[in-house]
């Protein structure tokens, strides 16, 4: 990029630039026509039978340096070749000198800074590589010369240029003194300023375009040349901040359209919301959950948003005394996740009717939540007692949720609790053919006992047709029609409301071997 | 503004010649083509020639070549223009004019006349 | 030399009208074509040159084109001081440079 600090070809008013000395054959100013039929300003000299070693000098304003250490000259000239004119002495000369002079003011004035070089500081001896030659009868034929020098390196505040002339035919059709900076440059999303370079390469930091952030690592910079280009080096850069993506060549940021979003800074572009999420504005890092879906905590901000599932379904209860093992199946709805759970809730009412939370006493197997498994089994029922048990499924969003949790119910009740096995099984009288038995009345926990049925047969006919029974309400029993001196083993149990209790263990008893020997009381 | 300045009204007998000057005041005078420009009375302009006086050579028109001779002077800064052979037809206003710009100082070679002398009334006659 | 023709040689116009005027060259001369305007008893003013360059100081009612062969002056809104007589001309530094015949205009 260059920044122009004088360019004679925008000039409309007349130079009046500084010429040294006042005498004929001086640098004249003059209107000429450019390339784009412009009138211009120039300067011309056409002294060329002076007497040798004379100068002529044409000194432009003042021009202040803005900050540029080398700045550059791009003269345009014409120049007339001394064999093409017949009056031309042997001064006559094909170039022309260019100093300059710094000050940091516009001090100069007709005779100062003295008119030669130091205090001048020469920049070049400039040739025309085309000569305007005449030949007799023959059209003139020449070209526009175009020289570009460099200034420098400028330390005050500006400065002058200067022309000398020793003798050529020449205008001066242009002046353009400009420097050279890097332009303001964005690459990678950084942003690197217009620079003037004041050194053969500058380092330039960068900084981030708006709704980006630095990458991690050393801070972006680029180098700036002197001749006003970045000097080719990859950039670490900037990328953009979450809820923006690279735009136009790495140049910007753009916010995620609606219905998109882009959850980290860095690479990549804005993605389609996930499933049940919306965003309904610009610039979204994240979707937002429509109602009754959610994220976990763990979720990652771009993962589908989800909802707690339905409840478990046809759940099926065995009891086993007091033991309970319910099963079910999963629900119908997952709600989108994969961490489903199970958890119960208990209630048990008593026979009377109140009813309250389970207590502690009962256990479940492998425990009454987070279960991962669609079984529990239930121990410590207490009999004639009902159980309400609510089967509800989870995942990772229901805690979130508001609302009643669904669930699915089953209710046990148990089975009231028999009499306890009648033992002390005891003989009171035997005969050949009949025994007389008695026991102690069982304590029954539900309501008294109703009635006993006994279980005998003789031993070691074991077959199911050589079993029989007696029922009997007392607590003893006369068992008759035995065999004469036959062993026989005898089982009792009790029975009340809640039912029959277990058989006691067996007893062993013997019928008598005569009648002779009468009735006779035996204890067991 | 550069001005042209050019001699007096002459009276010449056919046959015989006139020399016309054309100073030019101030400023450079080499680099500019001078050209020579008559008019016979109630008639059009009739361009003659042309010396750009740094070459010291002039052009003339097809019309009056052999008979008119452009010169210039660098150190006075005067054009001349002399016709020879004079008939009653030479009978006209001699205008010097002078280009628009240098031959240096246009990127093209346009060569108008911007500054015109005020004339000189040739009579020539018997 | 190159022969320059001008029409029309006279016309009659009113002051406001637009005014055309040609010049045609014997062969090419690219743009090096000058219209001047000379009133009676004055030297000749340049008005355009390079075909279609206004000189400073002209009226912007004048304006020139073409090039090659064929050329046109136009004075777009003719204003009193505009009746005088028009030269094409054909010139460049190093030819011989010849003029057109002239248009002379004149009060309607």
């Known amino acids: 990029l260059e920044e122009t600090l004088l360019n004679t070809k925008l000039e409309t008013a007349d130079l009046k630039w500084v010429t040294f000395p006042q005498v004929d054959g001086q640098w004249e100013e003059l209107s000429g026509l450019d390339e784009e039929q412009h009138s211009v300003r120039t300067y011309e000299v056409c002294d060329v039978q002076r007497a040798p070693g004379q100068a002529h000098w044409l000194r432009t304003g003042w021009v202040p340096r803005r900050g540029a250490v080398h700045v550059y000259a791009t003269l345009r000239f014409t120049m007339l070749e001394c064999l093409s004119l017949p009056r031309a002495g042997r001064s006559c000369k094909e170039t022309f000198t260019v100093f300059y002079y710094e000050s940091d003011a516009d001090t100069a004035t007709a005779l100062t800074p003295a008119w030669m070089e130091n205090p001048y500081i020469k920049v070049d001896t400039v040739a025309a590589e085309h000569l305007t030659r005449k030949r007799p009868g023959a059209e003139a034929t020449g070209k526009v010369n175009v020289k570009t020098l460099r200034l420098g390196p400028l330390s005050k505040a500006g400065f002058y240029l200067a022309f000398q002339d020793q003798g050529a035919c020449m205008a001066l059709l242009s002046l353009h003194l400009f420097y050279k900076k890097c332009a303001q440059l964005t690459v990678n999303l950084t942003r690197f300023p217009e620079t003037v370079p004041r050194e053969l390469v500058v380092p330039v930091a960068g900084s981030c375009v708006v709704d980006a952030v630095p990458a991690p690592g050393p801070s972006p910079s680029l180098y700036c040349r002197e001749d006003g280009q970045w000097a080719e080096q990859p950039v670490t850069g900037c990328s953009c901040a979450p809820g923006f993506e690279a735009a136009e060549g790495n140049t910007k940021c753009r916010a995620c359209a609606q219905g998109t979003f882009k959850p980290l800074s860095g690479e990549g572009s804005c993605q389609p919301c996930p499933a049940n999420s919306h965003s309904n504005t610009i610039g979204s890092a994240v979707c937002q959950c429509r109602v009754g879906y959610f994220r976990a905590r763990t979720d990652p901000r771009g993962a589908p948003c989800t909802t707690p599932p339905s409840a478990p379904r046809s759940v099926v209860s065995r009891l086993n005394g007091s033991s309970l093992h319910l099963e079910w199946s999963a629900p119908l709805e997952s709600g989108g996740r994969e961490d489903l759970t199970y958890a119960l809730r208990c209630r048990e009412c008593r026979p009377g009717g109140s009813c309250a939370p389970c207590g502690g006493d009962l256990t479940f197997d492998p425990g009454p939540r987070d279960l991962v498994e669609p079984w529990v089994v239930v121990r410590g029922l207490r009999p004639d007692f009902t159980y309400t048990f609510e089967v509800t499924a989870l995942n990772g969003v229901s805690s979130l949720a508001t609302g009643p949790v669904p669930f699915e119910p089953v209710n046990v009740t148990t089975d009231r609790e028999v009499p306890p096995a009648v033992s002390d099984i005891r003989v009171t009288r035997s005969s050949p053919s009949s025994l007389s038995l008695a026991w102690a009345v069982p304590r029954a926990p539900s309501g008294a006992v109703l009635d006993y049925e006994v279980k005998y047969h003789e031993k070691g006919a074991e077959g199911p047709s050589s079993v029989r029974f007696l029922k009997t309400s007392e607590n003893r029993a006369e068992l008759r029609g035995l065999k004469r001196g036959a062993s026989y083993l005898v089982q009792v149990r009790a029975r009340s409301e809640a039912g029959y209790g277990p058989f006691g263990q067996e007893h062993h008893s013997q019928t008598q071997l005569d009648e002779s020997e009468g009735w006779r009381e035996q204890l067991a | 503004q550069v001005e042209l300045v050019q001699s007096g009204a002459e009276v010449k007998k056919p046959g015989s010649s006139v020399k016309v000057s054309c100073k030019a005041s101030?400023?450079?005078?080499?680099?500019?083509?001078i050209s020579w420009v008559r008019q016979a009375p109630g008639q059009g302009l009739e361009w003659m020639g042309r010396?750009?006086?740094?070459?010291?050579?002039?052009n003339y028109a097809q019309k009056f070549q052999g008979r008119v001779t452009i010169t210039a002077d660098e150190s006075t800064s005067t054009a001349y223009m002399e016709l020879s052979s004079l008939r009653s037809e030479d009978t006209a206003v001699y205008y010097c004019?002078?280009?628009?710009?240098?031959?240096?100082?246009?990127?093209?070679?346009?060569?108008?006349?911007?500054?015109w002398g005020q004339g000189t009334l040739v009579t020539v006659s018997s | 030399d190159i022969q320059m023709t001008q029409s029309p040689s006279s016309l009659s116009a009113s002051v406001g009208d637009r005014v055309t005027i040609t010049c045609r060259a014997s062969?090419?001369?690219?743009?090096?074509l000058n219209w001047y305007q000379q009133k009676p008893g004055k030297a000749p003013k340049l008005l355009i040159y390079?075909?279609?360059i206004l000189q400073s100081g002209v009226p912007s009612r004048f304006s020139g084109s073409g090039s090659g062969t064929d050329f046109t002056l136009t004075i777009s809104s003719l204003q009193p001081e505009d009746f005088a007589t028009y030269y094409c001309?054909?010139?460049?530094?190093?030819?011989?440079?010849?003029f057109g015949q002239g248009t002379k205009v004149e009060i309607k």
């Open positions: 004019a002078r280009s628009s710009y240098t031959i240096l100082t246009t990127y093209y070679n346009y060569n108008a006349m911007d500054n």
């Open positions: 062969q090419n001369i690219n743009n090096f």
């Open positions: 101030g400023g450079t005078f080499s680099t500019y083509a």
């Open positions: 010396i750009i006086p740094i070459f010291g050579t002039a």
């Open positions: 390079g075909s279609s």
């Open positions: 001309q054909q010139n460049d530094f190093y030819s011989p440079s010849t």
